[in-house]
Every structure is written in structure tokens, then in C-alpha cells.
């Protein structure tokens, strides 16, 4: 069966900035800002686009050791990100995969709303354990608030692209984003 759980949560961070940090650079940020939730993210294959496989490892004390995620869609224009949990964690005898959709929508107050859909694909007529749904939701909330705190404390990070002069780059003048300056990896 397919069990869909939808969540809406708000952030004070503008949509574009949050998408950059939380979605596009989450692999680098998460272990840094929320080491209690994620210990490492390893790129197994791909360059961040559809088909990319990542291994997310969790610290000791959490229910699962790791999960493998497959990137299905990255929409930079509409701030949409679709991915599936395909291995590890709760995936096993009763659960085939978890398809996740995240859309970040700008709000008039300058913040954003995250619309999250988690579809659990179970084998046969198995139900999804409540604790799996909770663990996933609470993990997402933990990561979001950690990234949000980081962005509030580092007002220059992940801002809109700015014109960097030739001297700064030691090369020709071009548009560059803040995370490129800090050698953050793009997906």
C-alpha cells in the first residue's frame, strides 16, 4: 500500500535562501549544524541531479545506522526537491521505499512555508509504524531548525548571488554565490 503523510511548517528564512542552504547544500550543512542528527553524508554516485545516490549516516543512539537516498527531481525555479529513501533505515521486509517531496513557498512576510509529502510504499497490506513517521518528521524538523539557526547567525551565508570583483577571485569578474566562496559542494 501507499501511505501519504503531509506536513506544512514555516520558517523565517526567505524561500530562495532556505532552498540553497537546506536543499542544495544540506549534505554539507547537516553534519555541521546538527551532528546529533546526522554524522555524515556521502555522495555514492551522480552530481546532485536526478539519479544521484547519497548515503546518510546517523550517530550512535539513533534507531538507524544509515539510509540511502535517491534524488528524483531538483527544481531550482519552483524550489522543489523530490527524493526517495531506497535502502537502510526502515526499508526492509515491510517497507519498499519512502518517496518524499519538499516544496518551499515564499510568504508575504519574507519567510517561507515548507510543504512536505512523505509517501511510504509498503509491501502487501502492511501499515507504517507510527514511530517511523514520527522519527522522519522529527528528524526533518531538527534539521530545518538547525539550518534556520545557522542562517540567522550567519547573515552573509547563502544569500542572493553577488558580483565579485576580479581581485577577489584572481580571475575574471563573474556572478558567484556565497557557498561557492566557501567551497561548499553543490548538488
Amino acid at each position: 500500500g501507499v501511505f501519504n503523510y503531509e506536513t506544512e511548517t514555516t520558517s523565517v528564512i526567505p524561500a530562495a535562501r532556505l532552498f540553497k542552504a537546506f536543499i542544495l547544500d544540506g549534505d554539507n550543512l547537516f553534519p555541521k549544524v546538527a551532528p546529533q542528527a546526522i554524522s555524515s553524508v556521502e555522495n555514492i554516485e551522480g552530481n546532485g541531479g536526478p539519479g544521484t545516490i547519497k548515503k546518510i549516516s546517523f550517530p550512535e543512539g539513533l534507531p538507524f545506522k544509515y539510509v540511502k537516498d535517491r534524488v528524483d527531481e531538483v527544481d531550482h525555479t519552483n524550489f522543489k526537491y523530490n527524493y526517495a529513501v531506497i535502502e537502510g533505515g526502515p526499508i526492509g521486509d515491510t517497507l519498499e521505499k519512502i518517496s518524499n517531496e519538499i516544496k518551499i513557498v515564499a510568504t508575504p512576510d519574507g519567510g517561507s512555508i515548507l510543504k512536505i509529502s512523505n509517501k511510504y510504499h509498503t509491501k502487501g497490506d502492511h501499515e507504517v509504524k507510527a514511530e517511523q513517521v514520527k522519527a522522519s518528521k522529527e528528524m526533518g524538523e531538527t534539521l530545518l531548525r538547525a539550518v534556520e539557526s545557522y542562517l540567522l547567525a550567519h547573515s552573509d551565508a547563502y544569500n542572493e548571488q553577488k558580483l565579485i570583483s576580479e581581485e577577489d577571485l584572481g580571475g575574471e569578474q563573474k556572478l558567484i554565490s556565497e557557498e561557492d566562496l566557501h567551497h561548499h559542494h553543490h548538488h
Partner: antibody, heavy 125, light 107 residues
Framework: QVQLQESGPGLVKPSQTLSLTCTVS??????????WSWIRQQPGKGLEWIGY???????YYNPTLESRVSISVDTFKNQFSLMLHSVTVADTAVYYC?????????????????WGQGTTVTVSS | DIQLTQSPPFLSASVGDRVTITCWAS??????LAWYQQNPGKSPKLLIY???TLHTGVPSRFSGSGSGTEFTLTISSLQPEDFATFYC?????????FGPGTKVDIK
Amino acid sequence: QVQLQESGPGLVKPSQTLSLTCTVSGGSISSADHYWSWIRQQPGKGLEWIGYISYRGTTYYNPTLESRVSISVDTFKNQFSLMLHSVTVADTAVYYCAKVLQGLVRFRDYGFDVWGQGTTVTVSS
Amino acid sequence: DIQLTQSPPFLSASVGDRVTITCWASQDISSYLAWYQQNPGKSPKLLIYDAFTLHTGVPSRFSGSGSGTEFTLTISSLQPEDFATFYCQHLYSFPFTFGPGTKVDIK
């Protein structure tokens, strides 16, 4: 010891919004891993789980009510609230707030170990 | 959704009797089951969780057993304050549901 007390109007008109508050005393609503629930009991009927919320605001709802229900938390007042929109006479019930019993297994719920005394809400014009 | 059924719906018994109530789940819920007692005009009270663990302060005459789809609540020697309605509840998946209840009254 944690105690819960529901409050709110006892009479609501059809199509309006039912709004109830549960005040937590004897403990902090912000305790890690605590979840706070709403349950109702229609006259002469059994119990129905409405949904619950964590101290940080993540919510989980019964799909049968999800389109009409909203649960929120106010950590400063040590309260959590229920809003049920577009009520009908079928929403007439005793509404209980309750604390979820957590155990050794993280994120696993074991039952509702502390209950409020319940508040009767009648939907009538 | 997982459905729970209880048997019997009504039960007449005397003080001192041994009483057994059964709860069936529509699918395997492992041990994710709780039992409650509700006296008339009162809030439900948690008796048993995790199918067989007695909640703090609950008298030892109450016991729970079972796993998977069939569970029982047993009262070894019925006391006057035990005349009430008993509900089972699963906590396996969302939404959590309750059984329809078993009303125990005085014979």
C-alpha cells in the same frame, strides 16, 4: 505529577469553529519527547483519537478529521490547543486532552497515561 | 486503518470473579496495545501498555497478554471499583484507534 485541564466554550453553533485549550500543570510542556493529544467521545460511543502535537509543534492527525483540525502549542503558557472547523452536530462530544506515555524506544508511543477530566462540547443552533 | 474488536461487548459478573476480555486487531500490531478503564462520568485510565506491562499504580489483579492480533485483559478477582467500561487501543500506526469497549456490570 503532570495534570491536565481542558477549557473552552460548551456550546458551538453548526459551521463554526470549536476551540479548546488544555493547560498543563505540574510539569513542562517542553519536556523532550513528550507528545500532547486530543481524544473525543461522542455521547454513548467509544473513544476517537483526534491527533497530537510535540512541544516543538510537529503535528499528527487522524485522517478522518485532518481537513478540519488544527492542534497548536504555546510553550510560554504551558498550553496546547485544539481547533475544529466547520463543526456539525456529529462533533458533539466530550473532548479530552491527554499526555502520551513515552518509553525506552525513541518515538514509540505506549498509551495515554495522563488525562484531563474532559469538557463537554455541544454543537447546536 | 487498523480496526479493533472486543469481546464480549457486555459482561455481568460478581465481586471476586475472574474476568477475561479479548481484543482482536485487523492485522498484526505486535505488542503495540494498551488497555484503559473508564468509570461512568470519568476520564479513561491507563491500565496496561505494551500488551502486558502494568502501568504505575495499577493493582496487580489486572494483567494483559497476547501479541500480533489477539490480546486479553484479565482481572483475577473483580472488585467493586472495577465495574466500568474497558477499552483496548492500538498504537502501531496512525490513526491510533480504540476498540468499541466492554462494559462490565454487576450480576
